[in-house]
C-alpha cells in the first residue's frame, strides 16, 4: 500500500530512451498520443511531472516486515493527464483522471545505473514500461535474465 497520499518529492524532467530518443506527447482528436522519436536539435523536449510516493512492499513477499519500502512514481506530462498501464493491451496510455489516482498510474522506480531508470507496473510486477516500434508499451521482464534490457531503460533530464 502507498503510505501517504502526498508525494514525498516531485520533479519536472524530460524523458528519453537509453538511445537518447525523446518521449513526446501530442494532442490529437482530444486525446493525447505518446511518441518515441529523434528530436530536431532546436525542438524543446517535453517535460513530465514525476511525483514520488513511498510504498510499503508487502511483507509476505519480501520478508522485510516494515523495512521494505519502495518508491512509486506517477508521470504527468500535462495537467490532469497521467501515464497509465493497460495490462490487457500491453500498452501505455495517457488518461485524464482525478485523484486518488488508480493503481494503473503508479510505477515502481528502479535505478538501473546512476543515470538510467526503469518503471515497473504496480499492478503487474515484472512488467515494465518499454519501447516497442517507436511507441511505449508494457514489456514483461524475466528476472532470471539480465534486467539491463535497453528497451526498458530511460533517462531523466531536469
Amino acid at each position: 500500500s502507498i503510505t501517504g497520499i502526498s508525494p514525498i518529492t516531485e520533479s519536472l524532467a524530460s524523458l528519453s530512451t537509453y538511445n537518447d530518443q525523446s518521449i513526446t506527447f501530442a494532442l490529437e482528436d482530444e486525446s493525447y498520443e505518446i511518441y518515441v522519436e529523434d528530436l530536431k536539435k532546436d525542438k524543446k523536449k517535453d517535460k513530465v511531472l514525476l511525483s514520488y510516493y513511498e510504498s510499503q512492499h508487502p511483507s509476505s513477499e519480501s520478508g522485510d516486515g516494515v523495512d521494505g519500502k519502495m518508491l512509486m512514481v506517477t508521470l504527468s506530462p500535462t495537467k490532469d493527464f497521467w501515464l497509465q498501464a493497460n495490462n490487457k493491451e500491453h500498452s501505455v496510455e495517457l488518461h485524464k483522471c482525478e485523484k486518488p489516482l488508480p493503481d494503473q498510474a503508479f510505477f515502481v522506480l528502479h535505478n538501473r545505473s546512476f543515470n538510467c531508470v526503469s518503471f515497473e507496473c504496480k499492478t503487474d510486477p515484472g512488467v515494465f514500461i518499454g519501447v516497442k516500434d517507436n511507441h511505449l508499451a508494457l514489456i514483461k521482464v524475466d528476472y532470471s535474465e539480465n534486467l539491463g534490457s535497453e528497451n526498458i531503460l530511460f533517462k531523466l533530464s531536469e
Partner: antibody, heavy 121, light 106 residues
Framework: EVQLVESGGGLVQPGGSLRLSCAAS????????MYWVRQAPGKGLEWVAA????????YYPESVKGRFTISRDNAKNSLYLQMNSLRAEDTAVYYC??????????????WGQGTLVTVSS | DIQMTQSPSSLSASVGDRVTITCRAS??????LDWYQQKPGKAPKLLIY???NLQEGVPSRFSGSGSGTDFTLTISSLQPEDFATYYC????????FGGGTKVEIK
C-alpha cells in the same frame, strides 16, 4: 530487523591489501543498492563505493578509483570491499550502508557499526 | 563532482535553543539531499531525506528545508540527546557529504 555487520578490518602496511566484508540480514539483500562509507579518525564522512542490486554497475570517488573494488554475492547476502595499494590516508572506520528503498540509489537508510582499518608501517 | 559546504563547522547551544545548520551545494541538486546525525563511536543515523521528509522514529523537532543549492536543518528546541555531529549528503550527481557540524553544549 535489518542488520549489517562489517568485518575484515585491521592493521596493514602501506601498499598492502585488505578485503572487508559486510554480512546482511533481515531484508531482501538482492533488491538494494549498497554502499561503503568511511570516516578517518576525528574527520567527517566520505562516500567510498556504491553498487547496484544486480552488481551490474559500481561507482567510486576519484580518491579510491582504481584501488578499491566493491562487489557483492547476493546468494550469500554479502557485500565486499577489496582495497589495494593502501595508503596512510585510507586509515578510517569503514561502514557498510544500505539504500533506503528497494531498487533505488537514494538515501542511506541503514548502517553497520563499522570496522577499523589502520594503514601504518 | 559536487561539493557540499556546511556551516558552521561547530556551534555551542543550550537545551531549548533553536539551532539552524546550513548546507550549500556547488551546483543545483533539486532536493536530493539528506541529513544524518552521528554520535561519538556510533554509526550515522538518517534524519531527513529528499530535503524535507522526516525519517520514521525521528522527533518532529527536526525539520529540513531548501531546494536547488541551499538547504537548512533546523532543530526547533534542542534536547540533551541532540548534541552530536550533523552531516548533509547529496545523491543527485554521484554521492558526497558535507564536512559536518558539531553541536556542543554551551
Amino acid at each position: 530487523e535489518v542488520q549489517l555487520v562489517e568485518s575484515g578490518g585491521g592493521l596493514v602496511q602501506p601498499g598492502g591489501s585488505l578485503r572487508l566484508s559486510c554480512a546482511a540480514s533481515g531484508f531482501t539483500f538482492s533488491s538494494y543498492w549498497m554502499y561503503w562509507v568511511r570516516q578517518a579518525p576525528g574527520k567527517g564522512l566520505e562516500w567510498v563505493a556504491a553498487i547496484t542490486p544486480n552488481a551490474g554497475e559500481d561507482y567510486y570517488p576519484e580518491s579510491v578509483k582504481g584501488r578499491f573494488t566493491i562487489s557483492r554475492d547476493n546468494a550469500k547476502n554479502s557485500l565486499y570491499l577489496q582495497m589495494n595499494s593502501l595508503r596512510a590516508e585510507d586509515t578510517a572506520v569503514y561502514y557498510c550502508a544500505r539504500g533506503q528503498y528497494y531498487y533505488t540509489k537514494y538515501s542511506l537508510g541503514y548502517w553497520g557499526q563499522g570496522t577499523l582499518v589502520t594503514v601504518s608501517s | 563532482d559536487i561539493q557540499m559546504t556546511q556551516s558552521p563547522s561547530s556551534l555551542s547551544a543550550s537545551v531549548g535553543d533553536r539551532v539552524t545548520i546550513t548546507c550549500r551545494a556547488s551546483q543545483p541538486i533539486h532536493n536530493h539531499l539528506d541529513w544524518y546525525q552521528q554520535k561519538p563511536g556510533k554509526a550515522p543515523k538518517l534524519l531527513i531525506y529528499f530535503g524535507k521528509n522526516l525519517q520514521e522514529g525521528v522527533p518532529s523537532r527536526f525539520s529540513g528545508s531548501g531546494s536547488g543549492t541551499d538547504f537548512t536543518l533546523t532543530i526547533s528546541s534542542l534536547q540533551p540527546e541532540d548534541f552530536a555531529t550533523y552531516y548533509c549528503f547529496q545523491y543527485k550527481k554521484g554521492w558526497s557529504f558535507g564536512g559536518g557540524t558539531k553541536v556542543e553544549i554551551k
